[in-house]
């Protein structure tokens, strides 16, 4: 039960995380105009990975896409790449994890296969989360660098007569969404990996022995493991894994060549 809960929770947390990564990637507010001395501005600038926007105090907002690839800073391209890789890996991870969920039965899929898929999706979620965190952090670092550079050149003038105020940018909402989403995806991935350990059959030096008596079946498991008993209701032989925690879910799963002695 704990394994199913851990796996399910890991899936949900990752799902929320990936949705957040997608949202952050699409958001326009990666960097927003720093309102250092002026909390209310007549023209407010903010930028995303794909376009930059200007919101006027009149209520009009104008957004312009970056219609160039080669003209964009390499760092921005790198952030875009990291976020897209994160989304793709996360999406594949979600797809894999759906089939790996213990509560979903697909044909005669063995627990070992589900365990492998759970581990695979978990690793994908971890990498996806790391990509998102890395992407957001790279962008944040870029902002901090530019912020202090523009602060140093805050006012450039002609003989001190005419002032040109340089627009400084600070962290936008998308960065925080990205960090949180990346963290959630990472946590979800770790949970999936933990769930995988509970799903995976553990190899021991002993083999399970199944004794069949008329009227009911009793499975004796040497080595201090709990015996699994069924009175009358279990007409099929249960799969018995050494050391594997069993739940009611597996009663109808198909036997494999390793099930019997």
């Amino acid at each position: 039960m704990a394994v199913t809960a851990c796996q399910g929770l890991g899936f949900v947390v990752s799902l929320i995380g990936i949705a957040g990564i997608i949202a952050a990637t699409c958001m326009d507010q990666w960097s927003t105009q720093d309102l250092y001395n002026n909390p209310v501005t007549a023209v407010f600038n903010y930028q995303g990975l794909w376009r930059s926007c200007v919101r006027e105090s009149s209520g009009f907002t104008e957004c312009r896409g970056y219609f160039t690839l080669l003209g964009l800073p390499a760092m921005l391209q790198a952030v875009r790449a990291l976020m897209i890789v994160g989304i793709v890996l996360g999406a594949i991870g979600l797809l894999v994890s759906i089939f790996a969920l213990k509560c979903i039965r697909i044909g005669s899929m063995e627990d070992s296969a589900k365990a492998n898929m759970t581990l695979t999706s978990g690793i994908m979620f971890i990498v996806s989360g790391l990509c998102a965190i890395a992407g957001v952090s790279v962008f944040a670092n870029m902002l901090v660098t530019n912020f202090w550079m523009s602060t140093a050149n805050m006012y450039t003038g002609m003989g001190g007569m005419v002032q040109t105020v340089q627009t400084r940018y600070t962290f936008g909402a998308a960065l925080f969404v990205g960090w949180v989403a990346g963290g959630l995806t990472l946590i979800g991935g770790v949970m999936m990996c933990i769930a995988c350990r509970g799903l995976a059959p553990e190899e021991t030096n002993y083999k399970a022995v199944s004794y069949h008596a008329s009227g009911h079946s009793v499975a004796y498991k040497p080595g201090g493991f709990k015996a699994s008993t069924g009175f009358g209701s279990n007409t099929k032989n249960k799969k018995i894994y050494d050391g594997g925690a069993r739940t009611e879910d597996e009663v109808q799963s198909y036997p494999s060549k390793h099930d019997y002695v």
Partner: antibody, heavy 115, light 113 residues
Framework: EVQLVESGGGLVQPGGSLRLSCAVS?????MNWVRQAPGKGLEWVAW????????TYADDFKGRFTISRDDSKNTLYLQMNSLRAEDTAVYYC???????????WGQGTLVTVSS | DIQMTQSPSSLSASVGDRVTITCKSS????????????LTWYQQKPGKAPKLLIY???TLESGVPSRFSGSGSGTDYTLTISSLQPEDFATYYC?????????FGQGTKVEIK
């Protein structure tokens, strides 16, 4: 079509108060009060976001003037306190448009501060 | 606050003349976000409310005759009337639309010669 109609102007004694109204019809995201002293140029007084109610004032009017709006009546207000002789002017309400330009103006209401 | 200085304060011209009014701001009105200059031009006739002519330094407001044009960037701006018409005799104002408080130039009165 946007229409702006001001009212509430008149003669007031120095130190007195007056409330100007501007009946608004049509789409108005942000509204302003702009004044013009007799024979002088234009002077911006205050701005308000008609949705959030967030105001901004020119330094000379902070603390004395209050811009507000009543959504139910679709009306913009300018509450003027501690009036001085130099506040004598025609007060216009104006809508802020694309490019932060004032595209629609009321007909103006004259405020005279005199003893 | 951004100061706006218009020149000349008044000018005399005849119908058909080309008229140029300049406006200088104490700070750049060019917004880096969209590369647009937030300068607006108005026309005001005696006893009337001002009328918006040009925004973003060079964009003509709908319904404004094409003889009006605006140019400039940074701190220096110009309003040009290519061929002055009788109805163009009025006072013209430039406005800083870039930052609060919005500030206006002192105005340029265009009179009949």
């Amino acid at each position: 079509e946007v229409q702006l109609v001001e009212s509430g102007g008149g003669l007031v004694q120095p130190g007195g108060s007056l409330r100007l109204s501007c009946a608004v019809s049509g789409y108005t995201f942000s509204m302003n009060w702009v004044r013009q002293a007799p024979g002088k140029g234009l002077e911006w007084v205050a701005w308000i976001n008609m949705y959030t109610g967030e105001p901004t004032y020119a330094d000379d009017f902070k603390g004395r003037f209050t811009i507000s709006r009543d959504d139910s009546k679709n009306t913009l207000y300018l509450q003027m306190n501690s009036l001085r002789a130099e506040d004598t002017a025609v007060y216009y309400c104006a809508r802020l448009a694309r490019g932060n330009g004032f595209d629609y103006w009321g007909q103006g209401t004259l405020v005279t501060v005199s003893s | 606050d951004i100061q706006m200085t218009q020149s000349p304060s008044s000018l005399s011209a005849s119908v058909g003349d080309r008229v140029t009014i300049t406006c200088k701001s104490s700070q750049s009105l060019l917004n880096s976000g969209n590369q647009k200059s937030y300068l607006t031009w108005y026309q005001q006739k005696p006893g009337k409310a001002p009328k918006l002519l040009i925004y973003w330094a060079s964009t003509l407001e709908s319904g404004v005759p094409s003889r009006f044009s605006g140019s400039g960037s940074g701190t220096d701006y110009t309003l040009t009337i290519s061929s002055l018409q009788p109805e163009d005799f009025a006072t013209y104002y430039c406005q800083n639309a870039y930052s609060f408080p919005f500030t206006f130039g002192q105005g340029t009165k265009v009179e009949i010669k």
